[in-house]
C-alpha cells in the first residue's frame, strides 16, 4: 500500500507535470503566437484510456513529436528551450509511471491537435491529483 509520503511525492510530481503542461499550453495559445495556425496542423496520438499512472506511457511516446512542434514556435513565451522543457517532463513521467512492464499504449480513434493533446493530459493530471487529495 502506498505510504502518505509516497502519495505526497506523487502528488507533487503530478502538480509539477501539470504546471509544465499548462505553461506550454499558455505559451502556444498566446494571441501573439504567429505560428499557432501551423502548429495546429500537426497531429498527436491520444490515449484511448487515461485513468492510471501507467497510462502516462502514452504521453511519454508523444514527447518527442511535442518537442518538434514546440521548436517551430521559437517562442519567448517559454522560460526554457523546448528540449529542456520536454526533458524535464520526461523525467517526471518516467518516475510517475513506474516500472509497469506489460502496458502497451492503446490509442483513441482520432488524432488531436497540440491544444487538444495538452488539454487531455492536463485533465488527466488534475483528475489523478484530485483522487490523491
Amino acid at each position: 500500500a502506498p505510504t502518505s509520503s509516497s502519495t505526497k511525492k506523487t502528488q507533487l510530481q503530478l502538480e509539477h507535470l501539470l504546471l509544465d503542461l499548462q505553461m506550454i499550453l499558455n505559451g502556444i495559445n498566446n494571441y501573439k503566437n504567429p505560428k499557432l495556425t501551423r502548429m495546429l496542423t500537426f497531429k498527436f496520438y491520444m490515449p484511448k484510456k487515461a485513468t492510471e499512472l501507467k497510462h502516462l506511457q502514452c504521453l511519454e511516446e508523444e514527447l518527442k513529436p511535442l518537442e518538434e512542434v514546440l521548436n517551430l514556435a521559437q517562442s519567448k513565451n517559454f522560460h526554457l528551450r523546448p528540449r529542456d522543457l520536454i526533458s524535464n517532463i520526461n523525467v517526471i513521467v518516467l518516475e510517475l509511471k513506474g516500472s509497469e512492464t506489460t502496458f502497451m499504449c492503446e490509442y483513441a480513434d482520432e488524432t488531436a491537435t497540440i491544444v487538444e493533446f495538452l488539454n487531455r493530459w492536463i485533465t488527466f493530471c488534475q483528475s489523478i491529483i484530485s483522487t490523491l487529495t
Epitope: 511516446e61 514527447l63 506489460t102
Partner: antibody
C-alpha cells in the same frame, strides 16, 4: 538523428536458427514499442512481431507464433528477433521499425534472411 | 483480422499528373490507426501519412491522406520523378499490424 541498424541475417538451412539484432540510436529507446516487419523477395510488407518499451508485452503474427521470439535490451539500445525452426517461406528482408502510436515512423535498412538447403 | 485491399495494383502516370490510391478495409478502421508508406527499390519503407490524414515530418504537401471507416485514399497532387515507387497502407491499434498488398506507381 534516429538510426536503426539490423544485423544477423544470412543463409540458413530449413529447421535452423538465426538471431537478428537491431541497434538503435538517436532516441530514448526504452520509451518506444518496436516491431519487426519482413518482406519476401518481390512481395509486400508483412508485420512479424512487436514489443512494448519495457519488454514485458510481446505480439506475434500467426505465421511465426511459437517459432520466433522478440526481445530487447534497453541497456544496450538493442532489439532482437530469435528465429527457430526456420522455413523456406521465412526467406525475406527483415526490417526493425520504431513505433509512433500505431504507425512505424523510422525503419532500418533491413537484413536478408535466406532459408534454403 | 482486418484485411486491407489496395487498388489499383499498378498506376501508370506521367510526371505532373495526379495520383489517387485507394485502401479498403474489410471492416471499419479507426482513422487514428491508418498510415501510408512509400517504398523505393532497394530501400526501406518511409512513413508518409499517419492518422489517415497527417503528414509525417519532412513529407512534401503534395502528399495528402483522407478517408474514414473502411475507405481511405492517398493523393499525390502532382507527381514528381522521385514519387514513382510502391505505396502501402497499414493499420493496427499498437501491437499487431496489417499491411495492404501495395500499389505501384510507375512512369507511363
Amino acid at each position: 538523428e534516429v538510426q536503426l541498424l539490423e544485423s544477423g541475417g544470412g543463409l540458413v538451412q530449413p529447421g535452423g536458427s538465426l538471431r537478428l539484432s537491431c541497434a538503435a540510436s538517436g532516441f530514448t529507446f526504452s520509451s518506444y514499442a518496436m516491431s519487426w516487419v519482413r518482406q519476401a523477395p518481390g512481395k509486400g510488407l508483412e508485420w512479424v512481431s512487436a514489443i512494448n518499451g519495457s519488454g514485458g508485452s510481446t505480439y506475434y503474427a500467426d505465421s511465426v507464433k511459437g517459432r520466433f521470439t522478440i526481445s530487447r535490451d534497453n541497456s544496450k539500445n538493442t532489439l532482437y528477433l530469435q528465429m527457430n525452426s526456420l522455413r523456406a517461406e521465412d526467406t525475406a528482408v527483415y526490417y526493425c521499425a520504431k513505433r509512433r502510436g500505431p504507425s512505424f515512423d523510422y525503419w532500418g535498412q533491413g537484413t536478408l534472411v535466406t532459408v534454403s538447403s | 483480422e482486418i484485411v486491407l485491399t489496395q487498388s489499383p495494383g499498378t498506376l501508370s502516370l506521367s510526371p505532373g499528373e495526379r495520383a489517387t490510391l485507394s485502401c479498403r478495409a474489410s471492416q471499419s478502421v479507426s482513422s487514428s490507426y491508418l498510415a501510408w508508406y512509400q517504398q523505393k527499390p532497394g530501400q526501406a519503407p518511409r512513413l508518409l501519412i499517419y492518422g489517415a490524414s497527417s503528414r509525417a515530418t519532412g513529407i512534401p504537401d503534395r502528399f495528402s491522406g483522407s478517408g474514414s471507416g473502411t475507405d481511405f485514399t492517398l493523393t499525390i497532387s502532382r507527381l514528381e520523378p522521385e514519387d514513382f515507387a510502391v505505396y502501402y497502407c497499414q493499420q493496427g491499434p499498437g501491437g499487431p499490424a496489417t499491411f495492404g498488398q501495395g500499389t505501384k506507381v510507375e512512369i507511363k
